[in-house]
């Protein structure tokens, strides 16, 4: 069962190589690498590296990335993250402290600012830091629906841990119907989950961001480790040029 | 951009087919075909039948077939089916009728006959036949779990509609920890999604097969549309055989 | 996508999902699968050019990347993507048995 | 599975995925990634003998057509079957971009 | 088709002022940096600076030769490049060509070109 | 600044030739080198950006070639209508600058 040629790794490599200079280039849609005159000098700043290693960590709850589809998702995706709205703002009063929920509002001007169109996000997740917990938890995702009403997401059954972990809801179906309706304001609640005959709802989960009594004071940790949404979209000028070349081959 | 030889259809056709000759018989695992010397004369069982359409059929809520696992997933795989003790057995008088959920109870001696051994099921999964469905409904899984405990396993939103239509949950680690226990009875439950402030919390959604008061008659269709496992597993005699030959190449 | 619905419908010389349907008794001389009589097997084929090089007009090529040589390959080829099970009924004796073949239906290829 | 375990602690001649890091600087004379100063990008590379004709011994065959052939091609072929995306950052201008490029790390190979 | 066609040109007398124009058509004009360049009678090419795209702020940036005495703008509503010049110096006597500039460190498309003279 | 020198400033060539051009830069410009060809009264114009890459609607018997600080351009076989001056620029590091030009002429 042996083939005739005998193969040259080294040339093999090679063309690896070569093919996935190619390949980088062509998922950026660059003809060649942008120049690096105006980079400022010194390291990256903070947030940057913030959100790349955000991007780089699988978190939990988080799947494996599904096979793309074979055109638009073949392109690279920009990343960007909208944080949650501090918990001090007024969109909170609204909602009455409960024992089972917690509630996490985002400005959609924000949203709409790193991606334009709804047609143009290609993944968001809700990622929350989740501080110590003692006891296993069964969680649910909830999307502000209308007044007073909210629609059931999906849930994830947390496992006791003695450390904070990150946790990942594809929310991408949501935040697209988000970009193209008008609300200035939309939200999300994470509750504890409710059996029909049980009577001990409250949610154990201490989530980073919320400095209620009930949450103890996690002020010191928040800042960038409070709730937010990682956005994956095509960047708008990346699209255009999509459109414009939508023809096969 | 072209390649310089000329592909000759035919023979990539003849080729193929010739492979597909040989990967048929590799997936069961036979030397050569089966012989046709003992089968019995008419159509194929009604019941065979059934069983060959049910896996045929994707159904709602299953996901499409996973990038399978290279080795034991690439063989063919036995698929049996094993249907709900019926209602009028006694082990439902334990549980009390509520208008919240329904318990579909299964035979564990069944499930051994059908597969010896727990890491022979490769997937299990739970088919209930829906009836028509006035208005939305989200419905939770549950796996009993010790005396009068339930495990939550996973939910679905079902949308309104006016034909039966088949519903399927994967249950395979469920079943499979069936199979290594030593019960006699093991069962699920399909409740109404309870949230913590609603009150509304009544089991909508018709499935065939119950024949309570509030279920309405639906003896006329029962049979073999009543819940059932449908198990895909290695057969012991191909698993033994993987066993023997699990060396690399 | 490289799928039945674009490449049964062009006449595409790049890698494409090609038709291809197998009877079993016609094609394999069987007898022995009772359901399903054939299927849709199918099967990938057409080239993959390695369409990079230093001197290459680079701007022409990029564009082309994305269909010819996505994952970047010393030596792309046409290969399924997606792929669906096909459930037989055979018998073994006088048993009639139902197996379920996994990854036997071409739906779709790519250059990987 | 022919995965980087199994692969990169063997001498396995056949389909596997084999090592190779590529360091931006270095092997693409790039300095505009800022971050990741390179990656675990490997490639897949080996034979996947077609193991199938009328006359072959079927018994000795049947039991690699697992490995060699499991998709019954015409011509197999070993490629890309897991693989993990990479983020990279980069300035356009002054501003830097966070991006994430699907499908840039080989992690399993496969005959297809 | 990508087209710059710039307007403005004249004779200027020493430490006089002048705005020259731009007027682009045929690509998303935000969406990328312009810049001015000029050539003196019979010499090479010089770069003078650019305005930065929406993604970059619309900044500025100018060679030491002319920061303090040109200021470069843009009018995205008009798809429109200006350079205002300042004490103008004899030597300041050039074509002046717009020019769009890529991100790899390049222009790919300029324009005609507009003649300034600087003159007593 | 980086400072840009070309060589020769002048040439002469017959149709046909295959020539050069080159373009030294004062410090490593990491193959950000472009070359423009400028017409007699004409507006310059994009040949080859990042060391070798062709703009769109050049002829591919222009080419380029280097690294570090020296770089090529090279015309395989020259035509009338390549009468001309061309620039090399670098994009390495701002601010932009350009070569002083090679004046190619037919013989």
């Known amino acids: 069962l042996s083939t005739c040629k005998t193969i040259d790794m080294e040339l093999v490599k090679r063309k690896r190589i070569e093919a996935i200079r190619g390949q980088i280039l062509s998922k950026l849609r660059l003809a060649s690498p942008p120049s690096q005159g105006e980079v400022p000098p010194g390291p990256l700043p903070e947030a940057v590296l913030a959100l790349y290693n955000s991007t780089r960590d699988r978190v939990a709850g988080e799947s494996a990335e599904p096979e793309p589809e074979p055109e638009a998702d073949y392109y690279a995706k920009e990343v960007t993250r909208v944080l949650m709205v501090e918990t001090h703002n007024e969109i909170y009063d609204k909602f009455k402290q409960s024992t089972h929920s917690i509630y996490m509002f985002f400005n959609t001007s924000e949203l709409r600012e790193a991606v334009p169109e709804p047609v143009l996000l290609s993944r968001a997740e809700l990622r929350l830091l989740r501080l110590k917990l003692k006891v296993e938890q069964h969680v649910e995702l909830y999307q502000k629906y209308s007044n007073n009403s909210w629609r059931y997401l999906s849930n994830r059954l947390l496992a006791p841990s003695d450390s904070p972990e990150w946790l990942s809801f594809d929310v991408t179906g949501v935040v697209r119907q988000w970009l193209s309706r008008g609300g200035e304001i939309e939200g999300f609640r994470l509750s504890a989950h409710c059996s029909c005959d049980s009577r001990d709802n409250t949610l154990q989960v201490d989530i980073n961001g919320f400095t209620t009594g009930r949450r103890g004071d996690l002020a010191t940790i928040h800042g960038m480790n409070r709730p937010f949404l990682l956005l994956m979209a095509t960047p708008l000028e990346r699209a255009q040029h999509l459109q414009s070349s939508r023809h096969r081959r | 951009l072209s390649t310089c030889k000329t592909i000759d259809m035919e023979l990539v056709k003849r080729k193929r087919i010739e492979a597909i000759r040989g990967q048929i018989l590799s997936k069961l695992r036979l030397a050569s075909p089966p012989s046709q010397g003992e089968v019995p004369p008419g159509p194929l069982p009604e019941a065979v039948l059934a069983l060959y359409n049910s896996t045929r059929d994707r159904v709602a809520g299953e996901s499409a077939e996973p990038e399978p696992e290279p080795e034991a997933d690439y063989y063919a795989k036995e698929v049996t089916r094993v249907l709900m003790v019926e209602t009028h057995n006694e082990i439902y008088d334990k549980f009390k009728q509520s208008t919240h959920s329904i318990y579909m109870f299964f035979n564990t001696s069944e499930l051994r006959e059908a597969v010896p051994e727990p890491v022979l099921l490769s997937r299990a999964e739970l088919r209930l036949l829906r009836l028509k469905l006035k208005v939305e409904q989200h419905v939770e899984l549950y796996q009993k779990y010790s005396n009068n405990s339930w495990r939550y396993l996973s939910n679905r939103l079902l949308a309104p509609s006016d034909s039966p239509e088949w519903l399927s949950f994967d249950v395979t680690g469920v079943v499979r920890q069936w199979l290594s226990r030593g019960g006699e009875i093991e069962g699920f439950r399909l409740s109404a999604h309870c949230s913590c402030d609603s009150r509304d919390n009544t089991l909508q959604v018709d499935i065939n097969g119950f024949t309570t008061g509030r279920r309405g008659d639906l003896a006329t269709i029962h049979g073999m549309n009543r819940p059932f496992l449908l198990l895909m597993a290695t057969p012991l005699e191909r698993a033994q055989h993987l066993q023997s030959s699990r060396h690399r190449r | 996508a490289l799928d039945t619905n674009y490449c049964f419908s062009s006449t595409e010389k790049n890698c494409c999902v090609r038709q291809l349907y197998i009877d079993f008794r016609k094609d394999l001389g069987w007898k022995w699968i009772h359901e399903p009589k054939g299927y849709h097997a199918n099967f990938c084929l057409g080239p993959c050019p390695y369409i990079w090089s230093l001197d290459t007009q680079y701007s022409k090529v990029l564009a082309l990347y994305n269909q010819h040589n996505p994952g970047a390959s010393a030596a792309p080829c046409c290969v399924p993507q997606a792929l669906e099970p096909l459930p037989i009924v055979y018998y073994v004796g006088r048993k009639p048995k139902v197996e379920q073949l996994s990854n036997m239906i071409v739906r779709s290829c790519k250059c990987s | 599975a022919l995965d980087t375990n199994y692969c990169f602690s063997s001498t396995e001649k056949n389909c596997c995925v084999r090592q190779l890091y590529i360091d931006f600087r270095k092997d693409l004379g790039w300095k505009w990634i800022h971050e990741p100063k390179g990656y675990h990008a490997n490639f897949c590379l080996g034979p996947c003998p077609y193991i199938w004709s009328l006359d072959t011994q079927y018994s000795k065959v049947l039991a690699l057509y697992n490995q060699h052939n499991p998709g019954a091609s015409a011509a197999p072929c070993c490629v890309p079957q897991a693989l993990e995306p990479l983020p990279i950052v980069y300035y356009v201008g002054r501003k830097p971009k966070v991006e994430q490029l699907s499908n840039m790390i080989v992690r399993s190979c496969k005959c297809s | 088709e990508v087209q710059l066609v710039e307007s403005g040109g004249g004779l200027v007398q020493p430490g006089g002022s002048l705005r020259l124009s731009c007027a682009a058509s045929?690509?998303?004009?935000?969406?990328?940096?312009m810049s001015w360049v000029r050539q003196a009678p019979g010499k090479g090419l010089e770069w003078l600076g650019f305005?930065?795209?929406?993604?970059?702020?619309?900044?500025?940036e100018y060679s030491a030769s002319v920061k303090g005495r040109f200021t470069i703008s843009r009018d995205n509503s008009k798809s429109s490049l200006y350079l205002q010049m300042n004490s103008l110096k004899t030597e300041d006597t050039a074509v002046y060509y717009c020019?769009?500039?890529?991100?790899?460190?390049?222009?790919?498309?300029w324009g005609q070109g507009t003649l300034l003279t600087v003159s007593s | 600044d980086i400072q840009m020198t070309q060589s020769p400033s002048s040439l002469s060539a017959s149709v046909g030739d295959r020539l050069t051009i080159s373009c030294r830069a004062s410090?490593?410009?990491?193959?950000?080198l472009n070359w423009y060809q400028q017409k007699p009264g004409k507006t310059p114009k994009l040949l080859i950006y990042?060391?070798?890459r062709l703009h769109s609607g050049v002829p591919s018997r222009f080419s380029g070639s280097g690294s570090g600080t020296d770089y090529t351009l090279t015309i395989s076989s020259l035509q009338p209508e390549d009468v001309a001056t061309y620039f090399c620029?670098?994009?390495?590091?701002?601010?932009?600058?350009f070569g002083q030009g090679t004046k190619l002429e037919i013989k």
């Open positions: 305005i930065r795209n929406k993604p970059n702020g619309y900044t500025t």
């Open positions: 620029q670098q994009g390495d590091t701002l601010p932009w600058t």
């Open positions: 020019a769009r500039y890529t991100g790899g460190g390049y222009f790919d498309y």
């Open positions: 410090q490593d410009i990491s193959n950000y």
């Open positions: 990042y060391t070798s």
């Open positions: 045929g690509f998303t004009f935000t969406d990328y940096y």
